[in-house]
Structure formats: structure tokens, C-alpha cells
Interface confidence: low
Amino acid sequence: KSSNEATNITPKHNMKAFLDELKAENIKKFLYNFTQIPHLAGTEQNFQLAKQIQSQWKEFGLDSVELAHYDVLLSYPNKTHPNYISIINEDGNEIFNTSLFEPPPPGYENVSDIVPPFSAFSPQGMPEGDLVYVNYARTEDFFKLERDMKINCSGKIVIARYGKVFRGNKVKNAQLAGAKGVILYSDPADYFAPGVKSYPDGWNLPGGGVQRGNILNLNGAGDPLTPGYPANEYAYRRGIAEAVGLPSIPVHPIGYYDAQKLLEKMGGSAPPDSSWRGSLKVPYNVGPGFTGNFSTQKVKMHIHSTNEVTRIYNVIGTLRGAVEPDRYVILGGHRDSWVFGGIDPQSGAAVVHEIVRSFGTLKKEGWRPRRTILFASWDAEEFGLLGSTEWAEENSRLLQERGVAYINADSSIEGNYTLRVDCTPLMYSLVHNLTKELKSPDEGFEGKSLYESWTKKSPSPEFSGMPRISKLGSGNDFEVFFQRLGIASGRARYTKNWETNKFSGYPLYHSVYETYELVEKFYDPMFKYHLTVAQVRGGMVFELANSIVLPFDCRDYAVVLRKYADKIYSISMKHPQEMKTYSVSFDSLFSAVKNFTEIASKFSERLQDFDKSNPIVLRMMNDQLMFLERAFIDPLGLPDRPFYRHVIYAPSSHNKYAGESFPGIYDALFDIESKVDPSKAWGEVKRQIYVAAFTVQAAAETLSEVA
């Protein structure tokens, strides 16, 4: 059968039919349904939601919907022995204690099983000592403290404000600095937007609100006890001492009311500059310890959380492809939440649900996609991307041979200003073309395309007339597919105006106040931004699964490779003397990029001209496109990060959320001037240039004519 016969409707009509079937009212209804009680990973409530979604996806018309379960390490507070932080006087008496829970939002006062704020996977402990304020606890903050201010964090409890970087990196940095405990808090400077009221009267964080979250440094490992392999019934589990990524010091999060009580007494050094000051009426002194009057008082942490092997459940739905059933396009997002999940994840899960419903409607009318579409509702994302990673580990052989693309679907909104897209360069043209076909939901852009409003509000820093598309980092379920397996990946959501809102993420992130009402009252009352995100995510999946030639443009990879090579070269050129001394050359990398550019250009010409009615040639060309992302995978992985195997992109070693280009070279160059053995350090730079150049050249050759 030709592809058009198989899919039964003309391709243009298919896409329009699919998009027209998506309804804002349904997304709203699904969001309400998913947010009435907490769905914490490993709980009965989340298992019940998994079964509900399985049942509804079957009703919607998918060919099969299965639960895939794993037994992974999770972390919970002790219900009878709560976590808190005290100020103690010289007699050891607790003269101040932090709150044990967040005041519940209106209408939720009688909801049970709201997990109190905690840092997942914190070890137990009751350290006491002087406090040191470490700003955001970034690498550069500790450099400032230790190198410039000569402040030693060894044996101290550090207090860090949330924001800028992933919390796990903060904890790792504190550990490396010798701290014996970490207090994380939300400063109003980062989580309280000026001119907006606190929840429930607005979308700002109240003083008693607290951000939950895991503090692991997994580096893509998945379940800490079974790195590289699925946590199935016959798994061999590591002992807790050998588990991957667990923190070694107690950690606990607090809100800004409680933070004020700790910070207002701080003495010692003044903050080094204004970038260390938040918005509380406290001096932001660095410490160590409290001021004169309070100098005998100490801070004591009381952490009693436990790590437990617990069963989690993914829901995997299949819509079999009519022509290429062995080619998989995956749409996945998580289901587990810290509490109600009003934004994270259920604003995403509701969109996935509506996308499944629309695809199911088309299928019931006799249509099938060209390629197989897999839909996933992941569990335990909040505990370290565990559900997606375990499933990918279990199915890695299939995925690396058959995986065309992965589209992520966590939170659909983090604001209501404009679109935000992070994806592989292979998808740039797909995203551009799709957004030109969609209507903008933005006020002032009636009748204009989404591409137009997006480009106006978020212009590309390099190319005029084009929108910004960012690198993929991590901190979400695409990680295993992209960074480990090399499957082309992308994500899209509506975001805030980064120019005017300098706070980190959205204020109520991972708090009890992330409710349905937050979304319905303040972010998207008409659910028009949710609908737009559904159209973008669903449209990408539709095109990836249905277009005859895969909608990947390898020339866009060539463009960014040159940009990344220029960037890393300029970083290295900050050390011209050492480059000369150790004969460091980037010639091989620039040569490989040039070759890639030429070969990609020739491949694109052949792609225009080949006989698309010849199924063998069509499959061959599509396979070259599908396997291009795979060609950037180094089977040995990055140094000390074996599950980050993509040579062009990896999560930053200093911030899991951010993507870094040529990460092997970047990390080898980072802080190289402080290395004790410069010869060895520059040798590693040269090795990383070699690995990168080889990989780019090898990837280029996969696009060459096959014989």
C-alpha cells in the first residue's frame, strides 16, 4: 500500500482533522479530574490514577494500553517524627522551630496525605552548628566564598536560596565545600513577583509556602539501586552505600517566613555585592554564625526521612502504525506530583490525555498513522526521572533500533506570555513550519500565527525574524531518550516574560498551592494556552508519525555545530599561552564540522530528488535521518557520567536543568587555571577535542551516500 492509501485521508486533511478535534474545554475538564487529590509517586492514589488513565486511553481507541511497573528507591518523611529546623540556645533549648507543614489552600483543608515539605533522599541526621549563607549555592558562589572571602564552610550548616540552578547541584556543591547540612529556602526576590498577590489572591508564593524536590545527583542513572538496568522482579540491587547519587548530608526546604527567622540574626561577613541580596528585610550577612547578641545560638536540623524501595507504574499506550509499525514516535509526560500538581505535571498530563483522545477519534474513523505512536504516563519523575528511565532501560534495544523521536509533555505552562521550545536542531524546521500554521492565542496577535507572536516576544539571539529555540538540558523525562539513547527529542510549553520576571520558575512550583484553581483563576482561565501547547505537541507528534519523509533537517545541525565549535574555541583561547605550550589545536574539530556541513548539504539535495514511491529508498533515507541523532552517542559516555553519552549536548555539570554544548571539552576546560597538574588537564582537553572531532566526522559519514 502507498502511505496515502494506508492512512485513508490526504495528509493535509489528517493534520487539520487532528488539530480541530483538540478542545480547550476537555483539557480543563481533565486537569480538574487529575488535581483533586495528591498523586505522590509510590502511593495508592497514584496507582489508581494510572489505572484510570489506562482505562480511558483504551476507551479513546488506542490499540493497547499496559501498565509497566518497577520497584525503585523512593524517599518519604517519617509520619510520626516530622522534619524541622531549630535555633537552639547555649543550653540546647529550641527557641525557634520551623513550620511542620504549609497552611492548606482554601477548599483543601480536609484533604489527607499532603506530604509535608521535604528534600527527597536527604539522609537522616541532626547536625547542629553555625550558619553560612551561600547565595544560590552555585559553583561560582562557593568560589566567591572560599577563594575571595576566605570563608570556610567545613563543619557548617549552609543556607541557600532556591533558583538559578537545580537543587541537587546546590547540595553537591555544599557537600564538596564540607558543609554538614543544607537549608534551602525560597526568597521573595526569586519567588514573589512585584505587584502580584500571594495565593489564594494571586499566583505569588506566600511566606508559609515551600518548594519540595529531590536532591539527587543521578547523572542519568535512573533508580539509584539499579543503574543501567531495569528495576524489575529479578533485579540485583546495590546496597544503599553504593547507591548512585544520594546526598551525604541532611537537607531541608523552608519558606521565606521561616528563612527570615534564621537570616535576620546572621553576623560575620557582609554580602560581597548586591547580587547576594534577596528581598527579605535582613542584612544577608554571610556568617559564619549569628551576630554578637545571638552568637551563642546555633542552628539544628532534625531530619528523619526514610528511603524505601517502592512500586511505581508507567502507563504505556500504543497506536500501531499502518506502514512502518516498527518505527516509534513517543509522546510522554509524568503523572506523579508532589501534591496536587496543578501545573506540574497535570497541566501536561491533561494535554496528553486530549491528544490521545483526538488520535483515538481519528483511528475510530478508520485512520492510522504511518508510524507507531507510543503514549506514556510516567511515574516517579519527581524522584529522579525514574519511571521513564527504567522503561527505557528495559526497552533500550528496541528504542535504539526503532525510536524516531520523543516529545516531552510535562507542565504545559510556566507562564502565559509566549511559547518556549527546547529541542534537537533536527526539529527546528518542523517547529518553525508547524507554528506558522497555528493561530496565536496571545492578546494583540488576533489573526496572526503562533510563529509571529513567538518570534516577536522571544526573538532568536542569532537569526533575525526567527524565534529562540533552546538546547535541551535535563530535569525531565526526555533525558534518557536524548542524552543516553540519542533519540531526537523536543519539548514545548507556554512561558513567562523572562525580561520582566526575574524569579526562578514559577512562584508556586512544587508547593501545596499548585492547584487547579491556580491555573483556572490566574494563568489560563480560557485554557487557550493549554490548547496551543496541545496543538504544538500534538502537531509535532502527528508530523513525525505521519510525514512520508521524516521532518528532520540535518543542515540545521551543521549550523549549530559551527556555532558550538566557535564558542568552545573562544573559551579555550582565554588561555593562549597554555594552548601554545601544550600544542592544543581545534583544527580537527573545525575540519569535522566543515565536512559535516558539506555532507549534510548534499544529503538534503538528494532528499529533495529521490523517488519517494520506492519504499526501499524511502526507508533508507529516513533511516539515515533517524539514526543521525544516534550517531552523536559515544558508547563510553562522558567522563564520570556514563549515562550522559551525547557528545554534542549534556546537562551542565553545574546545573542539571541547563544544556551544555560540547560538554566533554567544556568540562575539561572549566576552572583549568586552578588544576594542580596543568599538563594532565590540558591533555584531557586535547583528548576531548579528539573525541568530539571524531564523533562529528563519524556522524557526517552516516549521511554520505551509502555506496
Partner: nanobody
């Protein structure tokens, strides 16, 4: 809005006890701290005691320390002040106050922007 209604005041002999109650109604969500402030005839308002919503932090003024205890029943949205060993100088109108304390304020400071009850008279006299 939040409504606060005090009860339990009265005339009592020195050395005896009284228990004041303050029932909160209306939009009580977001109330972070509740407390008692008193005003004796011809004098300024004086802070007596305060408690955070979680009950984890309480503060009692030095003038009543060891004699007065503040507590709160969240399920009933009620604040209590147990006053033992009463003295003549405890005679005053006792006001219940509640605050959703914006950041940057000392937690037990009550001011005009907070919620106040009408007050209940306590007279200690032989």
C-alpha cells in the same frame, strides 16, 4: 475578610484565673500568626502573646511570662489565652489580633493593617 470575636473576660480576684477565647471566622486561610494585645486605661497598647499557625513558635511578653499561656485549636479556628495568678496590673481590654504577615515584618508585630477583634474587658480587683 476575617472576623475575630473574643469571649471569656470578666471581673476576677487577684491570684485567680481566666481563660480568654478568640473565634476566627471568614477568610481564615493565610492567617500566619494570632495573638493577644491589651490596653489598660490611659495607656498604650501592649503586646501580650502570639503564636504561629503551626503552633511551633510562641512568644509571651516578659510581664506575663510564667503566668499566661497562649494556645490555638486550628480545627476550631480558635485562639486561647490561659491567664493564671492574675494581678491588678493585668486589668485591661484584651484584643485578639491576626495577621497574614507579609515578609519583612517581625512575626509577632501587630499593626493597624492586621485583623482585630472588638476586645473583651478583664478586671482584676479584690
Amino acid at each position: 475578610q476575617v472576623q475575630l470575636v473574643e469571649s471569656g473576660g470578666g471581673v476576677v480576684q487577684p491570684g485567680r484565673s481566666l481563660r480568654l477565647s478568640c473565634a476566627a471566622s471568614g477568610r481564615t486561610f493565610g492567617i500566619y500568626v494570632m495573638g493577644w494585645v491589651r490596653q489598660a486605661p490611659g495607656k498604650e497598647r501592649e503586646f501580650v502573646a502570639a503564636i504561629e499557625w503551626s503552633g511551633s513558635n510562641r512568644l509571651v511578653s516578659d510581664s506575663v511570662k510564667g503566668r499566661f499561656t497562649i494556645s490555638r485549636d486550628n480545627s476550631k479556628n480558635t485562639l486561647y489565652l490561659q491567664m493564671n495568678s492574675l494581678r491588678a496590673e493585668d486589668t485591661a481590654v484584651y484584643y485578639c489580633a491576626a495577621s497574614n504577615r507579609l515578609y519583612g515584618r517581625t512575626w509577632y508585630d501587630f499593626n493597624e493593617s492586621d485583623y482585630w477583634g472588638q476586645g473583651t474587658q478583664v478586671t482584676v480587683s479584690s
